[in-house]
Every structure is written in structure tokens, then in C-alpha cells.
């Protein structure tokens, strides 16, 4: 079966939207009205990976772009990046582990844990217009909870 994907936008728990910040970075900021059109639309693909009770493995691509969020070590630290891929080969059922996130969805709140680096989560800062990053703490200053809005 082909990989099933859905199109969505994500907002963090403070209702900050995610937008492009240069060619290979996302940032989180509050948007209103027409500015909401700036937010990135993700293509969330359901992929094969390790499953546990509340975790569903997904890959997060940017709709109509050959870019995927991926997790790599940079200077010995797990780091979130946007990685360019060959659109002829992606998405695929068995994505490389760096592209896989465990989607944890409880009461309409979502977390995205890196499959490559367990206990590291897609995170945003409390401050405005800061980069989206991979954070190693939940429930601290940084925000790891998101809501998802379906896009047709």
C-alpha cells in the first residue's frame, strides 16, 4: 500500500505557528489574519517503525517541497534540521530513522519524539520568532506540546 499522508499545520501550546526562516530552518511565532498563510503545511506520513502503546511513527515533510524534518548529531548534540530528499523516492514506508518521529497524541495534544534520539522532542521556545529545535526536556521552559489542524 502506498504511504498514507495527511496535510496539516502545527501550533505550539502557546498558539505560535511555524513558518520558514531561511531555506532550512523553521521558527515559531504568533500569527493572525492573513499572516496565517505564511505557516508551513506539513505532509505527515505514517511510516513503519517501532510502535508502543501511545506512539505512532510518522515522518514530517513540508507539503510540495522535497524537505523533511530530520534528527542528526551536530557537535555531539541531537539537532533538528530540514533535509532535502529526492522527491522520486520519498515518502516511503521504511524511512531512515533520522526522519522518523514518534507521534504521541493525548487529549488532542501532540508531542513528536525523535525515533533516532529517544526522549528528545520537537520543541519551541517561549520567546517569539525563535528556531524550532530538538529539546531534551519535557515540562520545562521549552514547549513540546502541539495541536494539529487538518488542511484539505
Amino acid at each position: 500500500a502506498p504511504v498514507r499522508s495527511l496535510h496539516c499545520t502545527l501550533r505550539d501550546a502557546q498558539l505560535k505557528s511555524l513558518v520558514m526562516s531561511g531555506p532550512y530552518e523553521l521558527k515559531a511565532l504568533h500569527l493572525q489574519g492573513q499572516d496565517l498563510e505564511q505557516q508551513v503545511v506539513f505532509s505527515m506520513s505514517f511510516v513503519q517503525g517501532e510502535e508502543s502503546n501511545d506512539k505512532i511513527p510518522v515522518a514530517l515533510g513540508l507539503k510540495a517541497k522535497n524537505l523533511y524534518l530530520s534528527c542528526v548529531l551536530k557537535d555531539d548534540k541531537p539537532t533538528l534540521q530540514l533535509e532535502s530528499v529526492d522527491p522520486k523516492n520519498y515518502p516511503k514506508k521504511k524511512m531512515e530513522k533520522r526522519f522518523v518521529f514518534n507521534k504521541i497524541e493525548i487529549n488532542n495534544k501532540l508531542e513528536f519524539e525523535s525515533a533516532q534520539f529517544p526522549n528528545w522532542y520537537i520543541s519551541t521556545s517561549q520567546a517569539e520568532s525563535m528556531p524550532v529545535f530538538l529539546g531534551g526536556t519535557r515540562g520545562g521552559q521549552d514547549i513540546t506540546d502541539f495541536t494539529m489542524q487538518f488542511v484539505s
Partner: antibody, heavy 120, light 111 residues
């Protein structure tokens, strides 16, 4: 803890319609990537998949029984209902509901099953 | 007639290793994940292996799965009497647009 429980009549007469309910807890069918399925097993025989419903209300049916089956969900009640029309003695089986997840499409948690006998 | 083909029965002595085969086609095993289930007598099936070779939570590592082309196999090492059960393979089938099961294999642990 994820659990699923099937309920419905133990005995139905030929030509009648069977209605089975799967009540689940520990997960939500509004969670993207979640599915619930019905599978049956006639006495001493193999497992046979019947129907599937996913978080977005997409429905899938086994080809041979498509005209007789209807699957639906009530997300607020955490229930999935299967109806099967025009029951026949060959439909006598244990009917299971099970959770499935999108990536692996594996039935990872099963109910205990409910035995349905079709006889006049 | 099941879409996936399994041997009806296999038997082996305790502490030995046994493999159960599952044969399909390009529309199911060839292009989709294979999952394996154990059904103990009188019980509901239980997921053992998913995504061809991943062990389900709480399952003994005596069980392992593999896949090559349009065939898959389940291996059980260090056989124990409690492994006596029916074993089913399953995979999504793109032609039928739904999951398909094998006919099941009855494992007997001798002695």
C-alpha cells in the same frame, strides 16, 4: 491500558441482521493513525478479516462480504459497530475486534471475542 | 483458500528451533509489512512480530521474524510446551485493499 470488548447476540436466526459493538478504552479513534477492525474465526478454521474503520472515517471491507457489511464509529462513546445482513449458518464464528495502527497495519491489541451462532 | 500460504502443522522437540513459513505475492508480502500472531487454544490471537522483524512489546526474544521477497518466516528457538499454539501470518494486500491472513500453522511440541 488498551482494552477492547465485543458485545452482541450469541444466537441469531438465518436471514436476520447481526449487530456487534466493539467498546474500547485506552486510546481514541480520533487519533490520527488509529484503526479498529473486525475479524472472525469459524470453529476450527483460520482467521478472516471483515472490515476496518480509520480515524478519518475511511472504511474498508473484505470483497466477498462487502454487500452485507457496514462498519461505523462513535468516537465520543469509544465504540465501533459492525452490522452484517442476511446471516447464514456458515457465518457461525467467534467475532473479534482489534486495534490497528497505520504504519505497521498490525492488529496489536485484540478483544476476547464473542461467539455468534446462526441457527433456526 | 487463504491468500497467504502456511504449512498446516509443524512439530519439534522441546529446546529445539522451529521455523514456520508464509508465502504470498508482490501485492501483499512483497510490498507490505508482515505480521505474526500466536493463538493459544481457546484464546484470542496475540501479536508477536510486526513490520517483518520487530518484536511486539512483552514478547519473548525466542521469537523472531524475517522476510525475503514474497516469503516470510517465523522462527521459535528454545521450544517450550507453552509455545503449542496456532500461528498466523498476515499482511496488507494492495489488490484486495485490506489485510489478509495465512491459513494458520499448528505447532506441536513433542514429548
Amino acid at each position: 491500558q488498551v482494552t477492547l470488548r465485543e458485545s452482541g447476540p450469541a444466537l441469531v436466526k438465518p436471514t436476520q441482521t447481526l449487530t456487534l459493538t466493539c467498546t474500547f478504552s485506552g486510546f481514541s479513534l480520533s487519533t490520527s493513525g488509529m484503526w479498529v477492525s473486525w475479524i472472525r474465526q469459524p470453529p476450527g478454521k483460520a482467521l478472516e478479516w471483515l472490515a476496518l474503520i480509520d480515524w478519518g472515517d475511511d472504511k474498508y471491507y473484505t470483497t466477498s462480504l462487502k454487500t452485507r457489511l457496514t462498519i461505523s464509529k462513535d468516537t465520543s462513546k469509544n465504540q465501533v459497530v459492525l452490522t452484517m445482513t442476511n446471516m447464514d449458518p456458515v457465518d457461525t464464528a467467534t467475532y473479534y475486534c482489534a486495534r490497528m495502527r497505520e504504519g505497521s497495519r498490525a492488529f496489536d491489541i485484540w478483544g476476547q471475542g464473542t461467539v455468534v451462532t446462526v441457527s433456526s | 483458500q487463504s491468500v497467504l500460504t502456511q504449512p498446516p502443522s509443524v512439530s519439534e522437540a522441546p529446546r529445539q528451533r522451529v521455523t514456520i513459513s508464509c508465502s504470498g505475492s508482490s501485492s501483499n508480502i512483497g510490498d507490505n509489512a508482515v505480521n505474526w500472531y500466536q493463538q493459544l487454544p481457546g484464546k484470542a490471537p496475540k501479536l508477536l512480530i510486526y513490520n517483518d522483524d520487530l518484536l511486539s512489546s512483552g514478547v519473548s526474544d525466542r521469537f523472531s521474524g524475517s522476510k525475503s521477497g514474497t516469503s516470510a518466516s517465523l522462527a521459535i528457538s528454545g521450544l517450550q510446551s507453552e509455545d503449542e499454539a496456532d500461528y498466523y501470518c498476515a499482511a496488507w494486500d494492495d489488490s484486495l485493499n485490506g489485510p489478509v491472513f495465512g491459513g494458520g500453522t499448528k505447532l506441536t511440541v513433542l514429548g
